[in-house]
């Protein structure tokens, strides 16, 4: 049986403020059943950057099409980067549990800092 | 070319077990989810059950009595069916789930299906 | 639990009509709903997902519509070979997976 690998490959990325940031998870199974959720930080205080199944996101978009089949790449975009983005981002998958999701694995996370200003 | 092959059904007796098998070939079997729905004669579609790796789900109307498992060396499905009634008189199929955007599953590919009839 | 109300139940239509089948959702599934053909003695076939995606090799005479709590099928001009029964199915809270009662199309 194939073991769930989450895949952030970056572990630093330098943004520039008002630019967008693209943060990169891709998985290695569809298992176990259940979705991926981003995050920014650890613990019960972490944010929720992006759930595709409900809530408003409006400056996170996805890198692959919602309509596509079988989708292993939840990587996401976040636009008009601010100072308040810098932090360490997780993606996340989650098991499916009734009624409550359950975490299942996380990516090993990538922090997002400013870089220097374009002169 | 997906394929799907239930095979097991046959007659059985209230209160009485039966094992079906779903033979799978032509995708990656081991990463999706896999799905058994039936159908009474001259009904509408009932979902049974789910598994995903070890994580697995039921209707109401089974839990307790049927189990789902895989076995993935064998791209082979199976539910086993115990202390059957005859409301559980269908056509099993086995059914391939399909995912669409980050998560929602539907079933993209079905097999034949094999008939379960619970008679005495 | 979601209950999926399919309207019609039955459909007597020509081949080259224009065909729509109703599927009403008793709370929002957003746009997490499949649509299947059932022939006769046959397994069901995927045609939509997403509400609105045609699965592969399906024609475009076949075409889905809809979100939160109405979707529609529709096909553009029956064909012969389109007789049979139509299912809904959500997917967006589950378990269970529910489906609709069904919508037979029947030749007048």
């Known amino acids: 049986e194939e073991e769930l690998q989450m895949i952030q490959p970056e572990k630093l990325l330098l943004v520039t403020v008002g630019k967008t940031a693209t943060l990169h998870c891709t998985v290695t199974s569809l298992l176990p059943v259940g979705p991926v959720l981003w995050f920014r930080g650890v613990g019960p205080g972490r944010e929720l950057i992006y759930n595709q199944k409900e809530g408003h996101f409006p400056r996170v978009t996805t890198v692959s099409d919602l309509t596509k089949r079988n989708n292993m790449d939840f990587s996401i975009r976040i636009s008009s980067i601010t100072p308040a983005d810098v932090g360490t981002y997780y993606c996340v998958k989650f098991r499916k549990g009734s009624p409550e999701n359950v975490e299942f694995k996380s990516g090993p996370g990538t922090e997002m800092a400013l870089g220097a200003k374009p002169s | 070319e997906v394929q799907l092959v239930e095979s097991g059904g046959g007659v059985v007796q209230p209160g009485g077990s039966l094992r079906l098998s779903c033979a799978a070939s032509g995708f990656s079997f081991s990463i999706y989810a896999m799905s058994w729905v039936r159908q009474a004669p001259g009904k509408g579609l009932e979902w049974v059950s789910t598994i995903g790796a070890d994580d697995t789900y039921y209707a109401d109307s089974v839990k307790g009595r049927f189990t789902i498992s895989r076995d993935n060396s064998k791209n082979t499905l199976y539910l086993q069916m115990n202390s059957l009634r005859a409301e559980d008189t269908a056509v099993y199929y086995c059914a391939k789930d399909s995912t669409v955007g980050w998560s929602g599953d539907f079933f993209d590919y079905w097999g034949q299906g094999t008939l379960v009839t619970v008679s005495s | 639990e979601i209950v999926l109300t399919q309207s019609p139940a039955t459909l007597s239509v020509s081949p080259g009509e224009r065909v729509t089948f109703s599927c009403r959702a008793s709370?929002?599934?957003?746009?997490?709903i499949a649509w299947y053909q059932q022939k006769p003695g046959q397994a069901p076939r995927l045609l939509i997902y997403a509400a609105s995606s045609r699965d592969t090799g399906i024609p475009d005479r076949f075409s889905g519509s809809g979100s939160g709590t109405d979707f529609t099928l529709t096909i553009s001009s029956l064909q012969s070979e389109d007789f049979g029964v139509y299912y809904c199915q959500q997917y967006y809270d589950w378990p269970p997976f529910t489906f609709g009662g069904g919508t037979k199309v029947e030749i007048k």
């Open positions: 709370q929002n599934v957003r746009s997490d």
